[in-house]
């Protein structure tokens, strides 16, 4: 189809080479006053909707995205050619950064109901550049945490080194919906609830003498509980003695619950005490067996190929530790009678 009639938008994605980061394009189809065909069943040209990307009409809940090859070849369907780009309704998600994402992206409704609708399309010219500005060492991350129940803020990564006074007007979106009251480079949250988590997008306009473009950054915000104030607890073994059969293989499992910590360095290990001697045992790797918002359960097993008489004189000790403290649980083996 002829894309010469598409409205055009220029965007800049400056990505940090230090961190994983994502990017999104919204299918910002023209507002009714620009092209009433895009929303013709919803609003008269006089009615101006709240400007939400892709929210103007049910007809637009499904759009087609294309990329325009730089060599002038025909438009390519995004879904067929680009596995690192995912389409979610009217949003295009770029899962990995890189200058190879630069290019022209076109979106239009799948359902073209009249000849006029052909012009109902948007061409987005995306320029992708690695961040070179070293002067801003502490720019905000593209992954930000909010502590549940406390005050917090979400900073626009591309503007976080500027003071509020210097900052241009910013347009914020949360999960694709416009946050119309937010205009500064930082969103302040008075009290954090779990619904504050999501994908936030901040846009601001930059221009030179020739043209203007939108600088966009994407922030993944998660809500977290406060760091635990408790040392880990051992859920298994509970008993300090274990009945065993001599000559048989044995696996003793240690399962420990660690409270949430933002910097999580759990320790779980087995050691053996034999009279005055004590040594750590080489055992299989620890593995997570459950994770929830508030805690994680980690398991580590000690495996004896066969239980010997000597093992009955030893104590097998599971040791667990986090930044708060440590806990141990010892197990003495006892021969099963009868």
């Amino acid at each position: 189809f002829n894309i010469s009639g598409c409205s055009t938008k220029k965007l800049l994605w400056t990505y940090s080479t230090r961190s994983e980061e994502e990017f999104v394009l919204f299918c910002d189809l023209p507002e009714p006053q620009k092209s009433h065909f895009c929303h013709r069943n919803r609003l008269s040209p006089k009615q101006v909707p709240e400007h939400l990307p892709f929210m103007g009409s049910n007809d637009l809940s499904d759009v087609q995205w294309y990329q325009q090859p730089s060599n002038g070849d025909p438009l390519e369907d995004i879904r067929k050619s680009y596995p690192h780009i995912i389409q979610d309704k009217c949003t295009l998600h770029f899962l990995t950064p890189g200058v190879n994402n630069s290019g022209s992206y076109i979106c239009r409704p799948k359902m073209i109901k009249s000849p006029y609708d052909v012009a109902c399309c948007v061409k987005m010219i995306l320029e992708v550049k690695p961040q070179t500005n070293a002067s801003c060492e502490y720019s905000a991350s593209h992954k930000q945490d909010l502590l549940l129940g406390s005050t917090g803020s979400i900073s626009c990564p591309s503007l976080s080194c500027q003071s509020d006074a210097q900052s241009p007007a910013v347009t914020w979106y949360k999960n694709g919906k416009l946050l119309s009251v937010e205009r500064s480079n930082r969103i302040v949250v008075d009290e954090v609830y779990d619904y504050h988590q999501g994908t936030y997008v901040c846009d601001y306009t930059q221009s030179d003498t020739v043209s203007s473009w939108t600088v966009r950054a994407v922030v993944q915000v998660r809500t977290i509980v406060g760091d635990t104030k408790l040392k880990p607890d051992i859920l298994d073994p509970v008993e300090d003695t274990l009945e065993v059969e001599l000559g048989k293989p044995l696996t003793i499992s240690c399962k420990a619950r660690f409270g949430f910590e933002r910097v999580f360095n759990p320790v779980i290990k087995w050691y053996i005490k034999d009279s005055d001697l004590e040594w750590e045992v080489s055992v299989p790797e620890a593995k997570s067996i459950k994770s929830t918002l508030k805690d994680e359960i980690i398991e580590r097993n000690i495996i004896l190929e066969k239980v010997t008489q000597r093992d009955l004189r030893r104590k097998f000790v599971c040791f667990v530790q986090n930044s708060i403290g440590n806990t141990t649980q010892s197990v003495q083996l006892k021969e099963k009678r009868g």
Partner: antibody, heavy 116, light 111 residues
Framework: SVEESGGRLVTPGTPLTLTCTAS????????MGWVRQAPGKGLEWIGI?????TTYYATWANGRFTISKTSTTVDLKIIRPTTEDTATYFC??????????????WGQGTLVTVSS | AAVLTQTPSPVSAAVGGTVSISCQSS????????LAWFQQKPGQPPKLLIY???TLASGVPSRFKGSGSGTQFTLTISGVQCDDAATYYC???????????FGGGTEVVVK
């Protein structure tokens, strides 16, 4: 909302990937589970991708399925489908503080039929 | 793996009456309370009713009540309505998520 896609008729042994797409929330902040239901039968727990990003599979499902997550989708791959894998596959969001059974948001399901 | 055994199906209830469904686990659930109840109607996905053994999910009428701890749990529907005709499933979470399971389901028929 969550929406499953990718269900279709496949022949036994042909790998199949189902996709769960989230709208209105970020998958990074939630556990996401997969559950299936054979025609006329009960619900069967397949596995869950926990909030830490680690995936946990039901004992019977280990080695038969893989679950992987991005910020917008959760995929369930049926590695070597058999006729017993014919079912509607549901994706669901987990919201519990200390639980992974609190599945509050479910998709409509996608039907997988395995037949030669 | 854990096994959850539910009251055999179907269970009949009169409109306005009370119905109880039991769910027994072969091992203790995590924290003694990691048990949820779901309602499913034909052609629809399951709907969360109760989590944490006794906490009512958002938007669920107060006539649904969950109780129990450890290995034995009950879902009670009082003042049964026609709309409550459905299959009900319990779901248990355990120390190891690999043991998580659903019960076999109990069909409630409203007369």
């Amino acid at each position: 909302s969550v929406e499953e896609s990718g269900g279709r008729l496949v022949t036994p042994g042909t790998p199949l990937t189902l996709t769960c797409t989230a709208s209105g929330f970020s998958l990074n902040s939630y556990a996401m589970g997969w559950v299936r239901q054979a025609p006329g039968k009960g619900l069967e727990w397949i596995g869950i991708n926990g909030v830490s990003g680690t995936t946990y599979y039901a004992t019977w499902a280990n080695g038969r399925f893989t679950i992987s997550k991005t910020s917008t989708t959760v995929d369930l791959k049926i590695i070597r489908p058999t006729t017993e894998d014919t079912a509607t596959y549901f994706c669901a969001r987990g919201v519990g503080d200390t639980t992974d059974t609190q599945l509050d948001l479910w998709g409509q399901g996608t039907l997988v039929t395995v037949s030669s | 793996a854990a096994v959850l055994t539910q009251t055999p199906s179907p269970v009949s209830a009169a409109v306005g009456g009370t119905v109880s469904i039991s769910c027994q686990s072969s091992q203790s659930v995590y924290n003694d309370n990691d048990l949820a109840w779901f309602q499913q109607k034909p052609g629809q996905p399951p709907k969360l009713l109760i989590y944490g053994a006794s906490t009512l999910a958002s938007g669920v009428p107060s006539r649904f009540k969950g109780s129990g701890s450890g290995t034995q749990f009950t879902l009670t529907i009082s003042g049964v309505q026609c709309d409550d005709a459905a299959t009900y499933y319990c779901s248990g979470g355990y120390i190891s998520s690999s043991d998580n399971a659903f019960g076999g389901g109990t069909e409630v028929v409203v007369k």
